[in-house]
């Protein structure tokens, strides 16, 4: 089943999706999708790459966050609404028959909740645990995974965890 | 044909304040993060603040965090930056410059103005 | 915080190739972009995400990057390539632009 991820309305939601180009910099299209992959492209395409950049977005709230050029092209969909909810397809096509890596996400998009995080925890907050609420320090915050960003280690993770507990800040965990 | 043309630079005694604009042409503004970059003279490049966008995110080089301001007006086309508390440090030639396609940073920047010149001295 | 380094400057003869190095730790890890700036004008893009180059930019332009070494080569080099070049990257730790300190290249005779 998909991974879910959660976001509250009016908040930005980040769905991981990466590959590790081989050779590096040898970039393949990727295509996201709102619904669960087909047998071939994505339906209801939201956002497009080519072999260099960004080529295609059908809407102006869906953004790569990510450095896709080093195959992070996680999908961030800024100012979430109720509608947003539902599966998302990130397809990596490969060149060749039936290569294509398929990855589907289920986001969950929901009403505000009334407990945030303390101020200062919430960069690394957003960081460190999908399906969880906060408020972003910049903005929108996002939903966000360790494994689609490079720069949080675990030690980090397990750190911020007791920092969560200690604040009194809600997780929710698939 | 992008264009970006900055405006508002000038001379201001320490402690002032100050307000860049960058008027955006020939492309869909509020499909770009968009960023001001400054340069000393005789220095440098030194990035100052970027902005999505929407301008629903901005940061800040800790240089200037807390006393500027970046923010955006997609219906009017223009990039602006609100200088408070100047400092002679500050003095430079502030470029806006256009971000990359599709890219919440923007990651490179693609396009240049040609740069207004701020001068922070008594 | 993340820091990148260039040679203050490099020589070069008319035709020869020049080579101008950007270093950081696993400098690799992340997309690099270069920037030509001539006296007076604003900075130009020559590459993007390590080797890409806008249109325009010749093809004498590449750009290379792996390990802690990012490169910008310009081959049969001209007078008219004189100018300063800056290296840049995104530290999507900090959510910073970060620039290298520059490297001005000089075309001798």
């Known amino acids: 089943s998909e991974v879910e991820y959660i976001a509250e309305v009016g908040q930005n939601a980040y769905l991981p999706c990466s590959y590790t180009p081989a050779p590096p910099g040898n970039l393949v299209p990727v295509c996201w999708g709102k619904g669960a992959c087909p047998v071939f492209d994505c339906s209801n395409v939201v956002l497009r790459t080519d072999n260099r950049d960004v080529n295609d977005r059908t809407s102006g709230r869906y953004w790569l966050k990510g450095d896709f050029h080093k195959g992070d092209v996680s999908l961030t969909i800024e100012n979430v609404t109720l509608a947003d909810s539902g599966v998302y397809c990130c397809r990596i096509q490969i060149p060749g028959i039936m290569n294509d890596e398929k990855h589907n996400v289920k986001l969950v998009v929901i009403k505000p909740a009334k407990v945030t995080p303390a101020p200062t925890l919430q960069r690394d907050l957003t960081s460190a645990f999908p399906r969880m609420l906060t408020t972003g320090e910049h903005g929108p915050a996002e939903t966000q995974t360790p494994g689609s960003l490079p720069d949080v280690n675990l030690t980090q993770i397990f750190t911020l965890t007791n920092e969560l507990r200690d604040s009194g800040a809600t997780i929710r965990t698939a | 044909e992008v264009q970006l043309l900055e405006s508002g630079g000038g001379l201001v005694q320490p402690g002032g304040s100050l307000r860049l604009s960058c008027a955006a042409s020939g492309f869909t503004f509020s499909s770009y993060a968009m960023s001001w970059v400054r340069q000393a003279p005789g220095k440098g490049l030194e990035w100052v603040s970027a902005i999505s966008g929407s301008g629903g995110s901005t940061y800040y080089a800790d240089s200037v965090k807390g006393r500027f301001t970046i923010s955006r007006d997609n219906s009017k086309n223009t990039l602006y930056l609100q200088m408070n508390s100047l400092r002679a440090e500050d003095t430079a030639v502030y470029y806006c410059?256009?971000?990359?396609?599709?890219?919440?940073?923007?990651?490179?920047?693609?396009?240049w103005g040609q740069g207004t010149l701020v001068t922070v001295s008594s | 915080s993340y820091v990148l380094t260039q040679p203050p400057s490099v020589s070069v003869a008319p035709g020869k190739t020049a080579r101008i190095t950007c270093g950081g730790d696993?400098?690799?890890?992340?997309?690099v972009h270069w920037y030509q700036q001539k006296p007076g004008q604003a900075p130009v893009l020559v590459i993007y995400y390590d080797s890409d180059r806008p249109s325009g930019i010749p093809e004498r332009f590449s750009g290379s990057n792996s390990g802690n070494t990012a490169t910008l080569t310009i081959s049969r080099v001209e007078a008219g390539d004189e100018a300063d070049y800056y290296c840049q990257v995104l530290d999507r730790r900090s959510d910073h632009f970060l620039f290298g300190g520059g490297t001005k290249l000089t075309v001798l005779g």
């Open positions: 410059a256009r971000g990359s396609y599709g890219t919440y940073y923007g990651n490179y920047f693609e396009y």
């Open positions: 696993n400098i690799g890890g992340k997309s």
